[in-house]
Interface confidence: low
């Protein structure tokens, strides 16, 4: 995946749905990465991705303070960014772009959450002049149901990703516990 | 029921027809695309456009983009198909259909048929 | 915009023949969906995701194919079937259809 003839094209935005009344304090704390799937997204059934965590923290001026938390190399490893308001409640961009190289644009679209079990965020971004999108399903535990995970798969195979490129990452306890 | 469409028309050449579909599903029918088809008689279908009605984002196929306007009110769950300077090739029966996150429609309204004629 | 064609337009089978309707792409598509429309109603969803029959649907339906060429197939032919069936893709906008295979019972 590593020319850009070689990426599936990201979907028109007309084809992400975005949660409809977006209640941004609702959507703060911790998120289990239950599903995973994209353009640069590969399954790798030998070596399946471990489940990571993601907190989302609301400061005063409305932005989130988003935190993912993995598990690589026997430790915790921390991620930390800032998602700016967009032109739409459940839509945002990244801030302080330009101290990420080559990145042009990053788009984050919440498409559909319960809030207190799950949700499915869409995000897309430029990077070395090459489109990248991805959909992650939220979970605020770390099983959901398969019913939930078919909607997945159906909506990620709708912006024309194929199975492959559709993982579901292993739950783990180490670092997302805490 | 999941659609329920408007019942039949009859308009003059050169005038106008508003056309709705309820969504009996509330909770879809913000994060669903609601789009039109229309069939002619003896024909197959032709896909006017769909409408994402959380944001009204509209979509509309090339050859209905002056012919078709889309609209949706999210309090009601009721989508709407706007078809101006109607002509006799617009009789036809149209169709709003549902697709959630898939490519295709899991329901389908009953169909308004509409007939231009002086 | 991405052709359907759907053949033949017209079939006729007997009670518990099998029968096959092909659906070919102008350009590779990654699902088909079917339809059946029976005379006076509104479109059923019936085949999605190229191979998964809706809620309801006789297990003796089947679909199959990918790229540019698919097909439904029925493997025994029951009177209830008759209809006419069509194909859909929404790999790119717009959606389209085929023109519809309409099948008869002899």
């Known amino acids: 995946q590593d020319s850009t003839s070689d990426l599936i094209p990201a979907p028109p935005l007309s084809k992400v749905p975005l949660q409809q009344n977006f209640q941004d304090n609702q959507f703060q704390g911790k998120w289990y990465v239950v599903g995973l799937a994209g353009n640069a997204i590969l399954r790798e059934d030998k070596d399946p991705q471990k489940m990571y965590a993601t907190i989302y923290e609301l400061k005063e001026d409305k932005s989130y303070n988003v935190t993912s938390v993995l598990f690589r190399k026997k430790k915790c490893d921390y991620w930390i960014r800032t998602f700016v308001p967009g032109c739409q409640p459940g839509e945002f961009t990244l801030g302080n772009i330009k101290s990420y190289p080559g990145l042009t644009s990053y788009l984050v679209r919440v498409v559909s959450t319960n809030y207190n079990q799950h949700a499915m965020v869409f995000f897309k971004k430029v990077s070395q002049n090459r489109e990248y999108f991805k959909i992650t399903l939220y979970g605020r535990t770390k099983e959901l149901t398969s019913e939930l995970k078919e909607n997945f798969i159906r909506f990620s195979k709708s912006l024309g990703l194929p199975e492959n490129h559709i993982v579901f990452p292993v739950p783990i306890d180490q670092c997302i516990d805490g | 029921v999941h659609l329920q469409q408007s019942g039949s028309e009859l308009r003059s050449p050169g005038s106008s027809v508003k056309l709705s579909c309820k969504d009996f599903?509330?909770?879809?029918?913000?994060?669903?695309?609601m789009s039109w088809v229309r069939q002619k008689p003896g024909h197959g279908f032709e896909w006017i456009g769909d409408?994402?009605?959380?944001?009204?984002?509209?979509n509309y196929g090339e050859k209905f983009e002056d012919k078709a306007t889309l609209d949706a009110d999210t309090v009601s769950n009721t989508a709407y198909l706007d078809l101006n300077s109607l002509t006799s090739e617009d009789s036809a029966i149209y169709y709003c259909?549902?697709?959630?996150?898939?490519?295709?429609?899991?329901?389908w309204g009953q169909g308004t048929t509409l007939t231009v004629s002086s | 915009q991405i052709v359907l064609t759907q053949s033949p337009a017209i079939m006729s089978a007997s009670p518990g023949e099998k029968v096959t309707m092909t659906c070919s792409a102008s350009?590779?598509?990654?699902?088909i969906h079917w339809y059946q429309q029976k005379s006076g109603t509104s479109p059923k969803r019936w085949i999605f995701?190229?191979?998964k029959l809706a809620s309801g649907v006789p297990a003796r339906f089947s679909g199959s194919g990918s790229g540019t060429s698919y097909s439904l197939t029925i493997s025994s032919m029951e009177a209830e079937d008759a209809a006419t069936y069509y194909c859909?893709?929404?790999?790119?906008?717009?959606?389209?259809f085929g023109a519809g295979t309409k099948l008869e019972i002899k």
């Open positions: 350009s590779s598509v990654s699902y």
């Open positions: 995701d190229t191979s």
């Open positions: 859909q893709q929404w790999r790119t906008n717009p959606l389209t």
């Open positions: 599903d509330s909770e879809v029918f913000p994060i669903a695309y």
């Open positions: 259909a549902r697709s959630r996150f898939e490519d295709y429609f899991d329901y």
């Open positions: 409408i994402l009605p959380s944001i009204g984002r509209t």
